[in-house]
Interface confidence: medium
């Protein structure tokens, strides 16, 4: 035989039990909520901050790039690569043919204002792509110069100058006073590079990395 | 739908399922305790043993930890 | 941690929580049912009403839908 509890004590015990159980429920739900919030908010904040950074970067160039043309890169919906709308894309870069005639330094500054540089050509495939968009009767500045006039050619983006991946016309470069490079068409040998005086106005080609959003 | 989107949808479903089940479990636990007390009060004394046995069952459940 | 990784980790946590709680809930439900049957079998007939009433309590719980 068990000694009988007072109904009052039993009710009090039940009340305590209920309190404990519901407290556990609240704590469990709170923990679940915290987990869920962390999962939803943190990544979105992470993504948001990344997007904000990207947008602020884009805002710098907004006056020049009011719209973007984007292509889905992978399976993931978030992997979009974009180029400003009039620009063309090839591999991981965007290209813009500037038809205004300017000196080499002004051309480079013009590209840099748009978040780009004068074009750096790294492969034959890249050159083959670029020339599809060029006019045969024009010359275009490249991002290649020899500021010392000592044939120490250097690319504007600090890419090492590799003699094996150059496309000079035969006999070029041929003048120590000509310190900037253009790409132009010669009927005898198609498209190639030539050294010219930097202050002589030419058209130019700008290149920038694709914008990933 | 992309992979991350699916993951968030699954998160939401599991989250809601967790909340609902937590509430159901706690409610059942309390109703079980209430039923045990009611059963104890209604018994004559002849059946105190039975009542006590039921009480013990609920006590055991009450302290039981979820499996790791 | 990257975005998707975090989501998958949370999925796993919620999934485990759901499984553990489902098992606990089912176990409690089964124990409640067993206790009711035991209580019914041990009663003399004089207390059939009491037993039935308890059974009803469990029946109600069994069919109850989760709160919306």
């Amino acid at each position: 035989m068990v000694p009988e509890e007072e109904p009052q004590d039993r009710e009090k015990g039940l009340w305590w039990f209920q309190l404990k159980v519901w407290s556990m429920a609240v704590v469990s739900i709170l923990l679940l909520s915290v987990c869920f919030t962390v999962s939803s908010v943190v990544p979105h904040n992470f993504m948001y901050s990344k997007t904000v950074k990207r947008l602020s970067k884009l805002r710098e160039y907004q006056q020049y790039h009011p719209s973007l043309t984007c292509v889905m890169e992978g399976k993931d919906i978030e992997d979009w690569s974009c180029c400003p709308t009039p620009w063309t894309s090839f591999q991981s870069s965007c290209y813009f043919i500037s038809t205004g005639m300017q000196s080499w330094t002004k051309s480079q500054k013009n590209c840099s204002v748009m978040g780009a540089d004068l074009v750096v050509i790294n492969t034959r495939e890249e050159q083959d792509f670029i020339i599809q968009n060029l006019k045969r009767n024009s010359s275009y500045f490249l991002g290649l110069s020899d500021p010392g006039g000592r044939r120490h050619w250097q690319w504007v983006d600090q890419t090492p100058y590799n003699e094996n991946v150059t496309f000079w016309h035969s006999g070029e470069p041929n003048n120590l006073d000509e310190r900037c490079a253009i790409i132009n068409f010669r009927s005898s040998e198609e498209w190639g590079w030539n050294d010219i005086h930097c202050h002589v106005p030419q058209k130019s080609i700008c290149k920038m990395k694709k914008i990933y959003i | 739908l992309g992979e991350p989107q699916l993951c968030y949808i699954l998160d939401a479903i599991l989250f809601l399922y967790g909340i609902v089940l937590t509430l159901l479990y706690c409610r059942l636990k309390i109703q079980v305790r209430k039923a045990a007390i009611t059963s104890y009060e209604k018994s004559d004394g002849v059946y105190t043993g039975l009542s006590t046995r039921n009480q013990e069952t609920y006590e055991t459940l009450k302290h039981e930890k979820p499996p790791q | 941690l990257g975005e998707p990784q975090l989501c998958y980790i949370l999925d796993a946590i919620l999934f485990l929580y759901g499984i553990v709680l489902t098992l606990l809930y089912c176990r409690l439900k089964i124990q409640v049912r067993k206790a009711a049957i035991t209580s019914y079998e041990k009663s003399d007939g004089v207390y059939t009403g009491l037993s039935t009433r308890n059974q009803e309590t469990y029946e109600t719980l069994k069919h109850e839908k989760p709160p919306q």
């Epitope: 500021p147 010392g148 600090q158 900037c180 930097c198 202050h199 | - | -």
Partner: antibody, heavy 119, light 111 residues
Framework: DVQLQESGPGLVKPSQSLSLTCSVT?????????WNWIRQFPGNKLEWMGY???????NYNPSLKDRFSITRDTSKNQFFLKLNSVTTEDTATYYC????????????WGQGTSVTVSS | DIVLTQSPASLAVSLGQRATISCRAS??????????IHWYQQKPGQPPKLLIY???NLESGVPARFSGSGSETDFTLNIHPVEEEDAATYFC?????????FGGGTKLEIK
């Protein structure tokens, strides 16, 4: 070796025009480079005035407004400075110099000619 | 216009020691790897002479004890070890933007 030599009046009256000549030997001014005028004030301050390039294009310092111009005589391999409406503030030593096309540093200088603006 | 500020205005260095002259631009004068700043040496009664172009390139015929460094807005001319003949005024010049401008000069004396 390239040599540059400035010549012109050492004294000019205010409001008059100053004309200077730079004679280049050892290099044709039509073959390349920028051909510059620079002046140095009594306190040692240097001021770039402008250039005429090998192909005849020119570039002037905006601070000189419309008072300044550069011309050349390719047959004599000379280029010239003309500064109108001079004031005492234009008192300086005037240098002609050859500037490399890029990055626009001046690698050869003349000896300079001293010009005083005084009534 | 881009303003170039040189410091110190004058400097006295013992023979064989290091002389350091600073040139600060009011805005960047760099195009990536190309820093469009140049250094000149001027001795009394002589025209300026180009020492260093594009921040760090030694003009032919200039002794290796002269060196230049820097980027964007801050540039330095170093002379080490200083010799008697280095007593002169040193100027920096920018060609990044028209009009080309010069620093105010730093007069180096040898102790």
């Amino acid at each position: 070796d390239v040599q540059l030599q400035e010549s012109g009046p050492g004294l000019v009256k205010p409001s008059q025009s100053l004309s200077l000549t730079c004679s280049v030997t050892g290099y044709s001014i039509t073959s390349g480079y920028y051909w510059n005028w620079i002046r140095q004030f009594p306190g040692n301050k240097l001021e770039w005035m402008g250039y005429i390039s090998f192909d005849g294009t020119y570039n002037y310092n905006p601070s000189l407004k419309d008072r300044f111009s550069i011309t050349r005589d390719t047959s004599k391999n000379q280029f010239f400075l003309k500064l109108n409406s001079v004031t005492t503030e234009d008192t300086a030593t005037y240098y002609c110099a050859r500037g490399v096309d890029y990055p626009k540093a001046m690698d050869w200088w003349g000896q300079g000619t001293s010009v005083t603006v005084s009534s | 216009d881009i303003v170039l500020t040189q410091s110190p205005a004058s400097l006295a260095v013992s023979l064989g020691q290091r002389a350091t002259i600073s040139c600060r631009a009011s805005e960047s004068v760099s195009m990536h790897v190309t820093h469009l700043i140049h250094w000149y040496q001027q001795k009394p009664g002589q025209p300026p002479k180009l020492l260093i172009y594009v921040a760090s390139n030694l003009e032919s015929g200039v002794p290796a004890r002269f060196s230049g460094s820097g980027s964007e807005t801050d540039f330095t001319l170093n002379i080490h070890p200083v010799e008697e003949e280095d007593a002169a005024t040193y100027f920096c010049q920018q060609s990044f933007e028209d009009p080309w401008t010069f620093g105010g000069g730093t007069k180096l004396e040898i102790k």
